[in-house]
């Protein structure tokens, strides 16, 4: 309704003597700002005066505030929105109705708020979930309809009068909707908490008791059981009797059914609190427990381990592992069902007792072929000795032994021969299935363990074979000792170290890489002519005529090998120089005369120089000197000089005669 002032605040506020009240409040006036505010206690409207009567706890006018009693009551609001109030301390006689008389310029309003002040601090209220089950987390809530800024309080949880370890979360609300203090505690109750008292205690800031609330926990849980057995150690011999009793120590709600379990499986027709076992057998050994159920679920007792003792049963042997590899470790395990466990063992290998072996396990750290055979054992405990079982077979596997490579050929072997070898061995487990040969080659294996080398190479030095089952055993290599003609025969210049110049002392060496047999002979030849029979060919003073193609031969009892032809090159200065003339040494003036410097040189002439009859050098650098047109005064002796990297050579003089042409003679 638009003619009303709008207020928001809690309907009733609760406190106790000496505490305080904080009243959260908001409003909206009909018009303009608040001009006057009076707080009444139990106001009553006086029709005669058209005013409200009652105790004025607080008053505020245009002129300013009227001091209240020691400022016990405070208006914390403003002129348009906030109407929050505080009373501190609050007294029992403050209970009743508070009236907020508000006046603006043209409008008036009376807003009523209930105040409930008790003589003593009122108790908080504990809220529990509808059902509590063991081990399921629940939240306990303690609520107090009180909160005031000027009066701090705390809520503490106690279980059977002892503070609870779990951390509680306390929250406070001081809003226009609600005023309260709340503590929440998360808690996982156990079956043992059933029937226990939980208290929420209200305390002041110093921890002084103010009030409390208590509840008794109703924790739903499965039956809690205890099992008793006769005899108490649950150890009996075959034929004895055993009694087990099941007692319920707690159940909420009451139990409904009883059953017995052996090794987790339910025993049929056993639905009472007592289990009687008569003339037990060893098969009845095991873990027993009783199970009692209620609406929450089944509860189980602790397990009782019933041991029915008996003498060892016939034993079996387990081998880790068979077949075993020679050199590996092997463990034998004697397995025999017995209770109590066997205290002594007797071991047999191929029916013969193994001395000093009395343990359940026999460990052989390094297996050898003679360890193969049948292993059996006998177990013994306080009740007797068992029987020897069938035993277990140990198979010891090993690589082929004493492998040898044997040459079948008559010796010596020559390069190109066909060689046959066989691979022999002494023993093997498992059997030999294949053979290997080293080095690898494109060789023939006509039968298992036989190798045929066609056209044996000079460098087939050694051959080794391996006999293989799961492993390969290699024989020591055998030397074929192949005999062959000298190899890699070549001519090598020993001196001079650099190029050969005419007049040098020259030594050539006939080298070869290998020969078998070692004894060799040498032969030197040039152009099919025998020059010497030493490993070296020597020239005291080499001449250009010694240049040419040289070969050396090396032979032994197997054959002979020739080197590649080696070219001997002799470097020499230009020699045998001569000047040739074209078309001849007599030429008519006006024609062309070509002079050519001919020579023998190694390396070839790199530079030519021409000279006239007065040894004057002519400006030509080529092998040919061309005079065109030639003149009569060019008649004379000419010579040339040739130069290469070794030196110089000069020609003898050659005379050119230039004669007059008929025209010249005619003019004279």
């Amino acid at each position: 309704d638009s003619s009303k002032w709008v207020f928001e605040h809690p309907e009733t506020l609760y406190a106790w003597e000496g505490a305080c009240v904080w009243i959260p409040c908001t409003y909206r006036a009909l018009d303009g700002d608040l001009e006057s505010f009076i707080l009444f206690h139990n106001p009553e409207y006086n029709k005669n005066t058209s005013k409200f009567d009652g105790t004025r706890l607080y008053e505020s006018t245009k002129d300013g505030k009227v001091p209240s009693e020691q400022k016990r009551v405070q208006f914390l609001g403003d002129k348009n929105k906030n109407c929050t109030l505080s009373i501190h301390p609050v007294h029992l006689n403050d209970s009743g109705q508070l009236g907020l008389r508000m006046e603006s310029k043209t409008e008036k309003w009376m807003e009523r708020i209930h105040l409930n002040v008790s003589e003593r601090p009122f108790p908080p209220h504990i809220q529990l979930p509808p059902e509590i089950q063991e081990s399921q987390e629940v939240t306990l809530t303690c609520l107090l309809n009180f909160s005031c800024y000027g009066y701090p309080i705390q809520l503490q949880w106690l279980l059977e009068g002892v503070p609870m370890r779990q951390a509680a979360v306390t929250s406070t609300s001081l809003t226009i909707k609600s005023v309260f203090t709340r503590s929440e505690l998360k808690f996982s109750p156990q079956w043992s908490h059933h029937g226990k008292i939980v208290t929420c205690q209200l305390q002041d800031a110093d921890g002084k008791f103010l009030s409390n609330d208590t509840v008794q926990l109703n924790v739903k849980h499965t039956p809690k059981l205890e099992i008793k057995v006769t005899p108490s150690d649950a150890i009996v011999r075959e034929g004895d009797s055993v009694t087990m009793t099941c007692e319920v120590s707690s159940s909420n709600p009451e139990y409904t059914t009883v059953s017995w379990l052996k090794d987790g499986t339910s025993l049929k027709k056993q639905n009472t609190f007592t289990l009687n076992l008569r003339e037990v057998t060893k098969d009845q050994s095991g873990k027993y427990c009783c199970q009692v159920s209620n609406d929450v679920g089944p509860g189980r007792s602790e397990e009782v381990f019933l041991q029915v003792q008996y003498a060892p049963e016939p034993s079996t042997v387990q081998i880790l592992h068979s077949p075993a590899v020679e050199g590996s470790q092997v463990e034998f395990l004697c397995m025999s069902l017995a209770n109590p466990l066997p205290t002594n063992y007797t071991w047999y290998h191929n029916g013969k007792e193994m001395q000093g072996r009395t343990e359940e396990k026999v460990h052989i750290p390094k297996i050898l072929p003679w360890h193969a055979g049948t292993y059996s054992c006998v177990a013994e405990n306080i009740l007797g000795t068992g029987q020897r079982g069938p035993g277990a077979e140990l198979d010891v596997q090993y690589p082929p032994k004493k492998v040898t490579t044997v040459i079948q050929n008559p010796m010596p072997i020559r390069e190109g021969d066909t060689v046959t070898l066989s691979c022999n061995y002494n023993s093997s487990n498992p059997s030999v299935t294949r053979y290997e040969w080293k080095p690898h080659g494109a060789w023939e294996e006509p039968s298992l363990g036989v190798l045929k080398i066609q056209n044996v190479g000079w460098d087939n030095t050694t051959i080794a074979c391996a006999a293989c089952n799961s492993w390969c055993s290699w024989a020591s290599p055998v030397a074929l000792n192949v005999q062959y003609a000298p190899r890699d025969v070549r001519v090598r210049k020993i001196k001079p170290l650099s190029e050969i110049h005419s007049g040098n002392s020259v030594s050539l060496q006939c080298d070869f890489s290998s020969s078998h047999p070692k004894e060799v002979q040498f032969f030197w030849e040039k152009n099919g002519r025998l020059l010497g029979k030493e490993s070296q060919l020597n020239f005291d003073s080499i001449s250009p005529e010694d240049a040419g193609s040289y070969s050396c031969w090396v032979n032994n009892s197997i054959g002979q090998t020739a080197s590649k032809a080696w070219t001997l090159e002799v470097l020499y200065a230009p020699r045998r120089l001569r000047v040739s003339m074209s078309p001849g040494d007599q030429v008519m003036e006006g024609k062309s005369a070509t002079l050519t410097c001919e020579s023998d040189a190694n390396p070839p002439v790199s530079h030519y120089t021409w000279f006239d009859w007065n040894n004057q050098s002519l400006p030509y650098h080529s092998q040919k000197l061309r005079l065109e047109p030639v003149k009569v005064q060019h008649s004379g002796a000419y010579w040339c000089q040739g130069t290469n990297s070794v030196g110089k050579g000069r020609s003898p003089l050659s005379t050119l005669t230039v004669y007059y042409s008929p025209e010249t003679i005619g003019r004279r």
């Epitope: 120089t609 400006p619 650098h621 060019h634």
Partner: antibody, heavy 127, light 112 residues
Framework: EVQLQQSGPGLVKPSQTLSLTCAIS??????????WNWIRQSPSRGLEWLGR?????????DYASSVRGRVSINVDTSKNQYSLQLNAVTPEDTGVYYC?????????????????WGQGTMVTVSS | QSALTQPASASGSPGQSVTISCTGT?????????VSWYQQHPGKAPKLMIY???NRPSGVSNRFSGSKSGNTASLTISGLQAEDEADYYC???????????FGTGTQLTVLL
């Protein structure tokens, strides 16, 4: 300092004879380590060696195959000069003509380069 | 007798190096160590810069150097200067009756 001074007409009619002279100062034509050369330059043919003369025990001359038969080099030792005669000229013979020396000895070793040049004469063959 | 082959043009900035090649045959460049290099400014006579492959006449800057490999000769100008802008010609003695052959010429531009 060796200098070569060229002289001769700049315009020659086709089929006539081109005649140029090169006067030498600072060196003798009779030197037995020099040769005396004629070279021409034209946009179409570039630099082209035409011929040379030199004196050792007598006078010698050499000519390029491209002009051999219509070229001659004459010497006047009294004036220490040499000349080029090129007969039967055509417009193809238009270009700048240079005389140049080659000194063949550089210390004890042989050498061969045009180390001194004349100033050049622009010759145009045109009717 | 064919002329020796040179690149038509070459260029470089001041301070840089430039190399000009001259390719002939075994009858000229490859056969003799008588290769020479000439510098020619417009309207002027050629000037000898390098003779006998790698020798420098007195008065020529040591920025100019020559070399030869097989049938190809080279002229290298280091630390280029503006005054190096000119035409460059190579020449070689030859075994033919035309005793000397020249290169086609290279125009060198100095980029300023």
């Amino acid at each position: 300092e060796v200098q070569l001074q060229q002289s001769g007409p700049g315009l020659v009619k086709p089929s006539q004879t081109l005649s140029l002279t090169c006067a030498i100062s600072g060196d003798s034509m009779l030197s037995n380590s020099d040769t005396w050369n004629w070279i021409r330059q034209s946009p179409s043919r570039g630099l082209e060696w035409l011929g040379r003369t030199y004196h050792r025990s007598t006078w010698y001359d050499d000519y390029a195959s491209s002009v051999r038969g219509r070229v001659s080099i004459n010497v006047d030792t009294s004036k220490n000069q040499y000349s080029l005669q090129l007969n039967a000229v055509t417009p193809e013979d238009t270009g700048v003509y240079y005389c140049a020396r080659v000194r063949l000895q550089d210390g004890n070793s042989w050498s061969d380069a045009f180390d001194v040049w004349g100033q050049g004469t622009m010759v145009t063959v045109s009717s | 007798q064919s002329a020796l082959t040179q690149p038509a043009s070459a260029s470089g900035s001041p301070g840089q190096s430039v190399t000009i090649s001259c390719t002939g045959t075994s009858s000229d460049v490859g056969g003799y160590n008588y290769v020479s290099w000439y510098q020619q400014h417009p309207g002027k006579a050629p000037k000898l810069m390098i003779y006998d492959v790698s020798n420098r006449p007195s008065g020529v800057s040591n920025r100019f150097s020559g070399s030869k490999s097989g049938n190809t000769a080279s002229l290298t100008i280091s630390g280029l200067q503006a005054e190096d802008e000119a035409d460059y010609y190579c020449s070689s003695y030859t075994s033919s009756s035309t005793l000397y052959v020249f290169g086609t010429g290279t125009q060198l531009t100095v980029l300023l």
